[in-house]
Interface confidence: medium
Amino acid sequence: APISSHCRLDKSNFQQPYITNRTFMLAKEASLADNNTDVRLIGEKLFHGVSMSERCYLMKQVLNFTLEEVLFPQSDRFQPYMQEVVPFLARLSNRLSTCHIEGDDLHIQRNVQKLKDTVKKLGESGEIKAIGELDLLFMSLRNACI
């Protein structure tokens, strides 16, 4: 299905050394607390059946879920990184607010639902895992949306 031209982020969003470093530091600190090594949230299964042109829209869904269901509830943890990274990711989410798919997005929603269920079923350790994969989220957004 074709994508609207709004599914784009400027390259400059991913070329800010300070916030990039803080994002990766946050991910590293959280991953040290993650003991569910069998589950990879952002990986091959997440993108199964999703064309390259649809991946930014998929990552928008993952970003919004991560912000609303993971980062906001865990905002008091992993300081000082969290207080800087969350507003940065929220700005990216805002910039993707007009990103929509023309046509059926059910195949994307299915994959995102699998990620959501995995995080929710793992409980707090699922939230920690999602934070520990913010480096993958960052890189996947970059690869999909610029």
């Epitope: 569910n36 090594t37 589950v39 299964k45 299915r110 639902q113 699998k114």
Partner: antibody, heavy 119, light 109 residues
């Protein structure tokens, strides 16, 4: 509450076909795959196949390929498993189960449907 | 397809600890999921992933993994734990089918 409710017990003759239904509720039907697993009397669990409830794509165990057909009715949020050319060895309890998450967790399961093949 | 191997039967004294194992090549990469099945009932998921319990599953159930072997441990086995236990896992090639181990019949003495 997520529920999978299966159709009632069936008695069939050898060579006949059987169609078992699995009515789902409590979640968005198209977002999850449904698998079928059978269990012969006193035996273990045997995976038969699965269906993508969104687009109807299916995959079957090699053992049942060509003899089993899994379909779905999205408006009825129901999945069906039809097994043809029944033999005595097909006497079993047939279960549907929802695949959850990224790593093949089956939860919940239907209550099971006993299919008896008898002349 | 790939195979998961379980011991057919294991017994444990009431209140003691028992370990049920599942072996297979895919378990070098992925953890097993574990299901409990009581006579005349459908299987129930008791452990998924590294050692995660669905709500309602007692904390006496836990899991571990080493090499190609996954283990389900019941610490302080109760009479109601008497059941068949099955493992399943992803294929290491990430493809279906998704077979189960042959099952282990647990008897609580």
């Amino acid at each position: 509450e997520v529920q999978l409710v299966q159709s009632g017990a069936e008695v069939k003759k050898p060579g006949a076909s059987v169609k078992v239904s699995c009515k789902t509720s409590g979640y968005k039907f198209a977002l999850y795959d449904i698998h079928w697993v059978r269990q012969a009397p006193g035996q273990g669990l045997e995976w038969m196949g699965w269906i993508n409830a969104a687009n109807g794509d299916t995959e079957y165990s090699q053992k049942f390929e060509g003899r089993v057909t899994i379909t779905r009715d999205t408006s009825a949020t129901t999945v069906y498993m039809e097994l043809n050319s029944l033999t005595y060895g097909d006497t079993a309890v047939y279960y549907c189960a929802r695949e959850e998450g990224l790593y093949n967790w089956f939860d919940p399961w239907g209550q099971g449907t006993l299919v008896t093949v008898s002349s | 397809s790939y195979e998961l191997t379980q011991d057919p039967a294991v017994s444990v004294a009431l209140g003691q600890t028992v370990r049920i194992t599942c072996q297979g090549d895919s378990l070098r990469i992925y953890y097993a999921n574990w299901y409990q099945q009581k006579p005349g009932q459908a299987p129930v998921l008791v452990i998924y992933g590294k050692s995660n319990r669905p709500s309602g599953i007692p904390d006496r159930f836990s899991a571990s993994s080493s090499g190609n072997t996954a283990s389900l441990t019941i610490t302080g086995a109760q009479a109601e734990d008497e059941a068949d236990y099955y493992c399943n896992s992803r294929d290491s090639s990430d493809k279906h089918p998704v077979p189960f181990g042959g099952g282990t019949k647990l008897t609580v003495l």
